[in-house]
Interface confidence: low
């Protein structure tokens, strides 16, 4: 765990002069309006900034926007508005940046009311040049790039047409009408739902799910009576209306919709919803809403086919469809997720799982913190994390929890220490071991970001007053230095650093305000001179992830294997560098019952690792739908957890027989599917 604050804090030598030489101010020649910022490519240093200006600051009939470009991580910006013919760019579409390092950018322009179609500006050279293209339609959504080929774009029109371009937006073709939702799948496949009668809203629950694998030359109807669909990992999900009533069920396909199986999940009524919380190629976390306006539901975790589900967490906080949930994937340690539950007394509590949803527990109380007023027992309480729900409730929480895959073990979040989340002003807490232990890092709410793969953490106090001070730590949040980056304080609006946390540059965005005018300003600080040297072997130490009992031979085993990482020592002040790769050494564990989830028809009683038969299914043949056929399951109740790599040890028996019978309950059986060509 992170060492306490009683350790001596060594100061970084001469940091003021070093940072002053590497602080770059840019004042934008704009009244305030709004600003959006995008990185173009990875490690290119190219940033695009779009400022748009319209009411409420000044009355004018048209907005105006300006486009700026930096190629040195934000230290200097050049006004390139002339490259887009001084056109007003629509902020609701954002800047559509191409995948990987394609260097592609699409900006959508505002056009006058009577025009035949919209207008876009396209760049394929990291925004050095733009080509204006008039569209044969008015876009409803941002242009979506195919993940496999950045020349392929799709967009929906305001008339609900599905438009595709094969040459990066130069020419467009309408491949289908009456389309509600469209998404790229793998291998340049497009999935989309269509309506037949009136509109997407009117036909909800009667939509058809279509697929094209050749950009609109031919189509296949892969589902009917569709309410909605989603893609997660290698899974395609559809929620499908039942024949006899207004309920709907989730169906899942792992072959792009050719065959479907009904997920063993509860059906939901009109007012309820399903939500894919997280998905990878192994499994999916699915939230199923409770009946009534409860604000909570149940998390289920899937098997490797997305069909058999185990109940993972009850009373999971999730407010209405498209509402707020605190579900957070802790990307700095495998298998770790944090979320909130709504307890019987309507208080909100944070739960954490270290084994991909197998077991959930409260967060351990930080050593250096007292229990607050929400705690019944002043010595026993937990840390509760503020995330999306708190932010939506306008609590004083400027940021959601933060973790980065290359800053191993580090999690930073706002929280309170008690029996439940408190509405009082939160503090900032850090974990350096993926959420097992926590330390109070900063007093009061802050914005924070991770630089140099965890080598530097930067924070700025959240305040309604203008600010001019930034804080930084080179030892994972134990000790902090403060740096005054400007004499004239600014109204702070955001911290920006290159996605991926490999950069050593941070941009502080805000605005200055004088009588009736306000201007955007950014300060970019490069920390390269603080971390003077490159890290060497001696700067790293071996760390066993998920270690809770060093005496135990199986210590650190999660999902069938343990991992040792090389971690930067807290005392080392050096650069991990942009090319830093996390070094880890995995080793396989013996199987135990913990490596298996309960199979269909079985469940785990609380505090028991054995799976027992569900009472209502005792003595019944276990039959379920798979690919539109009925299967007979012979099992002693266990199925290996998706992604679990254990070998040897416990090995429960399991056998599935094909009953050669059709499933009447499967609305997506292949017989109902058809194909057509354009």
């Amino acid at each position: 765990s992170a060492p306490g604050e009683d350790e001596e804090c060594g100061r970084v030598r001469d940091f003021v002069a070093k940072l002053a030489n590497n602080t770059h101010q840019h004042v934008f020649d704009d009244l305030r309006g709004s600003v959006s910022l995008s990185w173009v490519g990875d490690s290119t240093g190219v940033i695009l900034v779009l400022t748009t200006f319209h009411v409420p600051l000044v009355i004018m009939t048209f907005g105006q926007s300006k486009l700026y470009r930096s190629e040195d991580y934000g230290k200097n910006f050049k006004d390139i508005t002339d490259l887009i013919n001084n056109t007003f760019i629509r902020t609701e579409f954002g800047m559509a940046i191409g995948p990987e390092n394609s260097g592609k950018v699409v900006l959508t322009a505002e056009v006058s009311g009577g025009s035949r179609g919209g207008r876009i500006f396209r760049s394929s050279d990291f925004a050095k040049n733009f080509v204006q293209t008039d569209l044969p339609f008015h876009p409803l959504t941002q242009m979506m790039y195919s993940p496999q080929n950045s020349d392929y774009l799709l967009a929906l029109s305001t008339e609900n047409g599905l438009w595709v371009s094969k040459n990066f937006g130069g020419k467009w073709e309408e491949i289908h009408k009456a389309v509600c939702l469209a998404k790229w799948g793998s291998d340049n496949t497009i999935f989309f739902t269509t309506y037949a009668n009136g509109s997407c809203k009117a036909d909800l629950g009667a939509l058809e799910l279509w697929r094209t694998s050749d950009l609109g030359k031919s189509f296949k109807t892969i589902g009917v009576k569709i309410y909605s669909f989603g893609l997660g990992g290698r899974f395609l999900f559809a929620s499908v209306m039942a024949d006899k009533d207004t309920t709907r069920r989730i169906h899942v396909s792992t072959d792009q919709g050719d065959t479907w199986s009904m997920a063993q999940l509860p059906s939901v009524g009109q007012e309820q919803f399903y939500s894919i919380l997280a998905a990878n190629d192994d499994m999916v976390f699915m939230h199923v809403d409770e009946p009534g306006d409860t604000g909570f539901g149940t998390i289920f975790t899937s098997d490797d086919r997305g069909i058999v589900y185990s109940k993972s967490l009850d009373r999971h906080l999730y407010t209405t469809t498209g509402g707020e949930t605190d579900f957070t994937n802790v990307t700095s340690l495998r298998g770790v997720y944090i979320t909130s539950v709504l307890s019987e007394d309507n208080s909100i509590q944070t739960m954490i799982t270290f084994d991909q949803g197998g077991r959930w527990t409260h967060l351990r109380k930080p050593e250096n913190s007292e229990c607050d007023a929400t705690a019944k027992n002043k010595n026993e309480c937990s840390l509760h994390i503020h995330a999306s729900y708190s932010i939506s409730q306008k609590l004083n929480v400027p940021m959601a929890p933060l973790s980065e895959p290359n800053a191993v073990g580090i999690v930073i979040a706002h929280g309170s220490v008690g029996d439940a989340i408190s509405v009082m002003v939160p503090d900032v807490y850090i974990s350096d071991d993926g959420g097992y232990s926590w330390t109070k890092m900063l007093e009061g709410p802050h914005y924070y970001t991770i630089l140099d793969s965890g080598g530097i953490i930067v924070a700025i106090e959240h305040s309604s007053r203008p600010i001019n001070v930034i804080k930084f730590s080179t030892d994972e949040g134990q000790c902090w230095q403060t740096y005054t980056f400007t004499r004239d304080p600014i109204y702070f609006t955001g911290l920006a650093s290159e996605p991926g946390a490999r950069s050593m540059n941070i941009s502080i965005w805000g605005f200055t305000e004088s009588f009736l005018t306000s201007q955007w300003v950014s300060y970019t600080i490069d920390f390269k001179d603080i971390l003077e040297r490159n890290c060497e072997e001696k700067d790293y130490t071996i760390w066993l992830a998920h270690s809770t009992d060093p005496e135990d031979y199986e210590d650190g085993c999660i999902l069938g294997y343990k991992e040792q990482f090389l971690r930067l020592r807290k005392s080392s002040v050096c650069q991990n560098g942009r090319d830093y790769v996390v070094t880890k050494q995995p080793s396989i564990c013996l199987c135990s019952l913990e490596d298996f989830l309960c199979d269909f028809g079985y469940y785990r009683p609380e505090n028991d690792s054995k799976c027992v038969e569900q009472p209502e299914l005792k003595g019944h043949d276990l039959e379920f739908c798979l690919y539109g056929r009925e299967e007979h399951l012979t099992t002693n109740g266990y199925r290996k957890i998706p992604g679990d790599k254990c070998q040897g040890g416990v090995n429960p028996v399991r056998e599935v027989k094909d009953l050669k019978k059709k499933c009447t309950s499967n609305f997506l059986s292949p017989e109902k599917q058809n194909s057509k060509s354009n």
Partner: antibody, heavy 129, light 107 residues
């Protein structure tokens, strides 16, 4: 709780000026813009303008340009609306309304429109000779 | 300026019935639209913002829909306390403008 309390009713002669105050409480004053809306007897709502409590920048409807002045005092969390050269058609109830269209600290991204979510009780201004 | 037109000017409905109010903008306001309710002698009250999101504390019988130039406020089952004047308001371009209002009265 969040509330806006306006000053009392006023009776003015044509050609005079009136200054209506609106005191905010229960939230961070500098985080939200404030709009002023008026309603003549038996008529609909008419937007007059908006003020940003940070910096005090303003934006007025064309109809009131040159006659209206909106100011604020952050030390007392109060916004003022002064209307000059009054005429009989200015007889109306004047409302201040919190307008989160520019939540001043909501960050750079445009976040859509939230509506005027908190209104003052209204101040009746009567212009009569 | 953007002109907001509400129809009908008056709507006579019996309690328990459904009421549908329309609002049309002279040019697109995207979803930057709000609906307000006003009762005699009271300040307006925000019902719907962002064209379709219910404000805090507003009953589920009120719903808003539409985008661009055509918007609808629906009251699924009128209660006695719902008889009032309803206004739409755009915030796409300055100046903010209101519709003329629809009076919902008891039939």
């Amino acid at each position: 709780q969040v509330q806006l309390v306006q000053s009392g009713a006023e009776v003015k002669k044509p050609g005079a000026s009136v200054k209506v105050s609106c005191k905010a409480s229960g939230y961070t004053f500098t985080k939200y813009y404030m709009s002023w809306v008026r309603q003549a007897p038996g008529q609909g709502l008419e937007w007059m303008g908006i003020i940003n409590p940070i910096g005090g920048s303003t934006s007025y409807a064309q109809k009131f340009q040159g006659r209206v002045t909106m100011t604020r005092d952050t030390s007392t969390s109060t916004v003022y609306m002064e209307l000059s050269s009054l005429r009989s058609e200015d007889t109306a109830v004047y409302y201040c309304a919190r307008d989160p269209s520019g939540i001043a600290l909501a960050g750079p991204a445009s976040r859509g429109y939230y509506g005027m979510d908190v209104w003052g009780q209204g101040t009746t201004v009567t212009v009569s000779s | 300026e953007i002109v907001m037109t509400q129809s009908p000017a008056t709507l006579s409905v019996s309690p328990g019935e459904r009421a549908t109010l329309s609002c049309r903008a002279s040019q697109s306001v995207s979803s930057n639209l709000a609906w307000y309710q006003q009762k005699p002698g009271q300040a307006p009250r925000l019902l719907i913002y962002g064209a379709s999101t219910r404000a805090t504390g507003i009953p589920a019988r009120f719903s808003g829909s539409g985008s661009g130039t055509e918007f609808t406020l629906t009251i699924s089952s009128l209660q006695s306390e719902d008889f009032a004047v309803y206004y739409c308001q755009q915030a796409r371009l300055g100046p903010w403008t209101f519709g003329g209002g629809t009076k919902v009265e008891i039939k």
